[in-house]
Interface confidence: low
């Protein structure tokens, strides 16, 4: 697995994007929770599993860079000491990580106060606890539960040296009621410590949810450069205890230049 290369052209268009949330092509509106729940649980294992097992799908938001800076608490330079950050996990539970200026340098980010109900947002982490981002607005999460009412259209066109999924588009409609207990798989989170045992906090588009830690043989993402995970849009959890993310040995070639990585025993 690899993180998207900087040169890889990635365009994500979400139908729900509010007009006011234009700007960066990767920073539209939150693709709400229920379309993003992914599990690494393996079902229907085929007969003898000689090696690689299942393959996860996990989740991620685009790199931060926020169009609507600041929270709802007006803070002056006198009483507010900016805390630099790279991602939301580094901030408090009532904060999110973003550029402090509209359209500002994404490389300069600080922890900003979370946004209260009915305020504009672009991902769940921007909203204060008890709320989540839906259609660009922070709405109540109904006692930490989420009701699935989504209609999104995502068209992704990827440039990749090793071919692409051209025209890979997906239309997802979810209108069934689905409830998720806080900390369980699918729950919105800020950091992995918010998730139950065996889960990590990972992102999918603009959401961050609890996802299962990867098992042996599952496809994992090996980050070549520090910070490259910020370019992912479907982040995967890390490999479980006793496992590491390593290149899958090619049975037919001596070279190990393949980019396919799986969780393997140390």
């Amino acid at each position: 697995m690899m993180a998207l290369g900087a040169a890889g052209a990635t365009r994500v268009f979400v139908a729900m994007v509010a007009a006011a949330l234009g700007g960066h092509p990767l920073l539209g509106v939150s693709a709400t929770l229920n379309s993003v729940l992914n599990s690494n649980a393996i079902k229907n294992l085929p007969p003898p599993l000689g090696g690689a097992a299942g393959h996860p799908g996990s989740a991620v938001s685009a790199a931060p860079g926020i169009l609507y800076p600041g929270g709802n608490k007006y803070q002056t330079i006198d009483n507010y000491q900016p805390y630099p950050c790279a991602e939301d996990e580094e901030c408090g539970t009532d904060e999110y990580c973003a550029s402090p200026t509209r359209g500002g340098d994404a490389g300069v980010q600080i922890c900003l106060a979370c946004r209260k109900r009915r305020k504009r947002c672009m991902r769940h982490a921007m909203c204060c606890p008890g709320n989540y981002c839906k259609n660009g607005i922070c709405v109540s999460s109904d006692q930490n539960h989420f009701r699935g009412e989504i209609e999104e259209t995502i068209t992704e066109s990827f440039g990749n040296d090793h071919s692409t999924l051209d025209g890979y588009s997906r239309r997802t409609t979810l209108s069934s009621k689905m409830y998720h207990t806080k900390g369980q798989e699918g729950s919105v989170c800020l950091r992995s410590s918010d998730c139950a045992s065996g889960l990590c906090c990972a992102r999918h588009f603009w959401s961050k949810i609890c996802k299962p830690v990867l098992k042996e043989g599952q496809v994992c993402t090996k980050h070549r450069r520090k910070g490259s995970h910020g370019l992912e849009i479907f982040q995967r959890c890390y490999c479980g205890e006793g496992l590491s993310c390593r290149i899958q040995k090619d049975h037919h070639q001596a070279s190990n230049s393949s980019r396919l990585h799986t969780c393997q025993r140390h």
Partner: nanobody, 121 residues
Framework: EVQLVESGGGLVQAGGSLRLSCAAS????????MGWYRQAPGNQRELVAS???????NYVDSVKGRFTISVDSAKNTVYLQMNSLKPEDTAVYYC???????????????WGQGTQVTVSS
């Protein structure tokens, strides 16, 4: 019940082509295809082509430039186009996908039953 069914395998001469299909059926809300694996006799199962965390595709070195993974989301189907087949491509090919089903109201990882590809020299 959700099922993944592969088809398109068969016997082909070296240099020939096959197109494998993997169709998901059942109470599917969202189909998230992951990749194709293969297992040759006496070998471990290996990942052949996968959809990356960034949504692109990656291939094991031995099939690069010959195999192409693609998806038809409307049909809940993932394909593996295999060109310039070689005898060493002979194996049982399995598809793998994460599926959110309305019956289970959860994401689960599913495997197909496998389809045999035999390349004769």
């Amino acid at each position: 019940e959700v099922q993944l069914v592969e088809s398109g395998g068969g016997l082909v001469q070296a240099g020939g082509s096959l197109r494998l299909s993997c169709a998901a059926s059942g109470s599917i809300v969202t189909f998230n295809p992951m990749g194709w694996y293969r297992q040759a006799p006496g070998n471990q199962r290996e990942l052949v082509a996968s959809i990356t965390s960034g949504g692109g595709a990656n291939y094991v070195d031995s099939v690069k430039g010959r195999f192409t993974i693609s998806v038809d989301s409307a049909k809940n189907t993932v394909y593996l186009q295999m060109n310039s087949l070689k005898p060493e491509d002979t194996a049982v090919y399995y598809c793998n996908a994460d599926i959110f089903s309305s019956s289970r109201l959860s994401w689960d990882n599913y495997w197909g039953q496998g389809t045999q590809v035999t390349v004769s020299s």
